[in-house]
C-alpha cells in the first residue's frame, strides 16, 4: 500500500470519529495518521505534528495499518518437514506449511507449527479416509473379497480378481491367483487411488504374501498423531 498523504493532526468534532486509517491519540487529543503495512510509528503525533512512520527493518513486519512503536519479528525459519509458502517481507510474516506426505498436527494462526508424517496403511489395510493438510490418513481392514498388498498412505482396498479357476484364493493382503485361463475382474484392473493433496503416490511392489492379522469386523483407526495403530506403519 502507498504511504498515506500527509496532513496536520486535527481535533475531531464532538460526536464524530477519526477517519479510516487514523487513530485518536489520547495524549495529543487529536486524530493522527496510522502507519501503513510495512511501517511502524517512529515518532508519535503531537498537537502540531503528525505521526512519523518508518519502514520495518529486515526480518520484521507489520501486516495492518498501525501505530506500533516496533515492527513484529518474523517467525523462525521453516523446519525440514515444512516448505515456506510465504516469505518474510516488511508486510507479511513467514508462513510454513507441511511438505507432501506430511500433515499439520498443530496449526497456528497462519501456517503450521508442527507437521507429522501421514500414516501408511500396511498390507491388508486400505485408506478409509485420505489425509488432508490438517488430518491424518485413516486406515481400515480390507473387507472380504478385497485386498491391499502395499504399504501406502493413498491406496484403498481393491477387489480380488475373479477367476474361472482359482489357483490360490485371495486374502486381505493378496490378490487371488488364477490358473492360466484369463481372469475377469469385478472392477477395472490396476491400483485404485484416493485423491491425495498432500502425499505423493507410493510405488507398488509385490511383497511376499502374508496372512492378514486384521480382525474380521470392520473398524476405523483413530485420527491424529498417535503411535502406529494396527494396520498402519511408521515411516
Amino acid at each position: 500500500l502507498p504511504a498515506q498523504v500527509a496532513f496536520t493532526p486535527y481535533a475531531p468534532e464532538p460526536g464524530s470519529t477519526c477517519r479510516l486509517r487514523e487513530y485518536y491519540d489520547q495524549t495529543a487529543q487529536m486524530c493522527c495518521s496510522k502507519c501503513s503495512p510495512g511501517q511502524h510509528a517512529k515518532v508519535f503525533c503531537t498537537k502540531t505534528s503528525d505521526t512519523v512512520c518508518d519502514s520495518c527493518e529486515d526480518s520484521t513486519y507489520t501486516q495492518l495499518w498501525n501505530w506500533v512503536p516496533e515492527c513484529l519479528s518474523c517467525g523462525s525459519r521453516c523446519s525440514s518437514d515444512q516448505v515456506e509458502t510465504q516469505a518474510c517481507t516488511r508486510e507479511q510474516n513467514r508462513i510454513c506449511t507441511c511438505r507432501p506426505g506430511w500433515y499439520c498436527a498443530l496449526s497456528k494462526q497462519e501456517g503450521c507449527r508442527l507437521c507429522a508424517p501421514l500414516r501408511k496403511c500396511r498390507p491388508g489395510f486400505g485408506v478409509a479416509r485420505p489425509g488432508t493438510e490438517t488430518s491424518d490418513v485413516v486406515c481400515k481392514p480390507c473387507a472380504p473379497g478385497t485386498f491391499s498388498n502395499t504399504t501406502s498412505s493413498t491406496d484403498i482396498c481393491r477387489p480380488h480378481q475373479i477367476c474361472n479357476v482359482v489357483a490360490i484364493p485371495g486374502n486381505a493382503s493378496m490378490d487371488a491367483v488364477c490358473t492360466s485361463t484369463s481372469p475377469t475382474r469385478s472392477m477395472a484392473p490396476g491400483a485404485v487411488h484416493l485423491p491425495q493433496p498432500v502425499s505423493t503416490r507410493s510405488q507398488h511392489t509385490q511383497p511376499t504374501p502374508e496372512p492378514s492379522t486384521a480382525p474380521s469386523t470392520s473398524f476405523l483407526l483413530p485420527m491424529g498423531p498417535s503411535p502406529p495403530a494396527e494396520g498402519s506403519t511408521g515411516d
Epitope: 500500500l1 498523504v5 496532513f7 464524530s16 470519529t17 477517519r19 479510516l20 486509517r21 501503513s36 495499518w65
Partner: antibody
Framework: EVQLQQSGAELARPGASVMLSCKAS????????MQWLKQRPGQGLEWIGA????????RYTQKFKGKATLTADKSSSTAYMQLSSLASEDSAVYYC????????????WGQGTSVTVSS | QIVLTQSPTIMSASLGERVTMTCTAS???????LHWYQQKPGSSPKLWIY???NLASGVPARFSGSGSGTSYSLTISSMEAEDAATYYC?????????FGGGTKLEIK
C-alpha cells in the same frame, strides 16, 4: 482483478433483521477498509460505516449505530452487515465498497443488495 | 458534518456540448479528498475522478475536474451519449464521509 460479490435481494417484515454479505477477491482482504453505503430509490448515497478486517476495527455514523452491525470473516474474505429492527425507511440498495488505501476514495464497489421491508 | 451541495440537480446537454457541474462544500475540504462518481440506472456507482482532478482508470480524457477549498467542478469538454448518467461528488476530508445529492445529466 478486484471483485466484491454481494448477496442476493432480501424481502423482510418490519421488525425483522437481515444479514448482507460481501465476498472480496483479487486483493489482500485484511489490508483495506470495507465500507457500506445506503441508497434509497431515486436518492443519493449515505455512508453507514466501515470495518477493517485486519483487526476488526469498526466505525459507524451516528445515525446507523444500533441499526447496522459490521463484521468480517478473514478466512472467507467476506464482510457482513446486519440490519436490525427493520422499518420501511430501511428499504434501499446497500453497497459494500473498498477504501482505496490512499485518498479515501471508494475504488471498487459491489453490485448492491436490494432490501425491501414490507408487511 | 460537511454538507456537499451539487448544482444543477438536473441538466441536459446536446452531443458535442461542453458541460460543467459544481459541488459546493459547507466548509473547506482538502482537494486530495474530494472525489466524483458516475452512476447509471440499475448499476453501482463507479469512481470517476479522484483527488479533484485525477481520472480513474478507463475514464475518457474529455472529463476533467478542478477546484479547491469549498468549490469544485466536473467538466466534460464534448458531451457524448454514454456520458448521460448521475454524477456524485464525495468528500472524506472529515468524518463522516458525505456525498452531494447528485447531478443528473441527460441528452438534449
Amino acid at each position: 482483478e478486484v471483485q466484491l460479490q454481494q448477496s442476493g435481494a432480501e424481502l423482510a417484515r418490519p421488525g425483522a433483521s437481515v444479514m448482507l454479505s460481501c465476498k472480496a477477491s483479487g486483493y489482500t482482504f485484511t489490508s483495506y477498509w470495507m465500507q457500506w453505503l445506503k441508497q434509497r430509490p431515486g436518492q443519493g448515497l449515505e455512508w453507514i460505516g466501515a470495518i477493517y478486517p485486519g483487526d476488526g476495527d469498526t466505525r459507524y455514523t451516528q445515525k446507523f449505530k444500533g441499526k447496522a452491525t459490521l463484521t468480517a470473516d478473514k478466512s472467507s474474505s467476506t464482510a457482513y452487515m446486519q440490519l436490525s429492527s427493520l422499518a420501511s425507511e430501511d428499504s434501499a440498495v446497500y453497497y459494500c465498497v473498498r477504501d482505496d488505501g490512499l485518498y479515501y476514495a471508494m475504488d471498487y464497489w459491489g453490485q448492491g443488495t436490494s432490501v425491501t421491508v414490507s408487511s | 458534518q460537511i454538507v456537499l451541495t451539487q448544482s444543477p440537480t438536473i441538466m441536459s446537454a446536446s452531443l458535442g456540448e461542453r458541460v460543467t457541474m459544481t459541488c459546493t462544500a459547507s466548509s473547506s475540504v482538502s482537494s486530495s479528498y474530494l472525489h466524483w462518481y458516475q452512476q447509471k440506472p440499475g448499476s453501482s456507482p463507479k469512481l470517476w475522478i479522484y483527488s479533484t482532478s485525477n481520472l480513474a482508470s478507463g475514464v475518457p480524457a474529455r472529463f476533467s475536474g478542478s477546484g479547491s477549498g469549498t468549490s469544485y467542478s466536473l467538466t466534460i469538454s464534448s458531451m457524448e451519449a454514454e456520458d448521460a448518467a448521475t454524477y456524485y461528488c464525495h468528500q472524506y476530508h472529515r468524518s463522516p464521509p458525505t456525498f452531494g445529492g447528485g447531478t443528473k445529466l441527460e441528452i438534449k
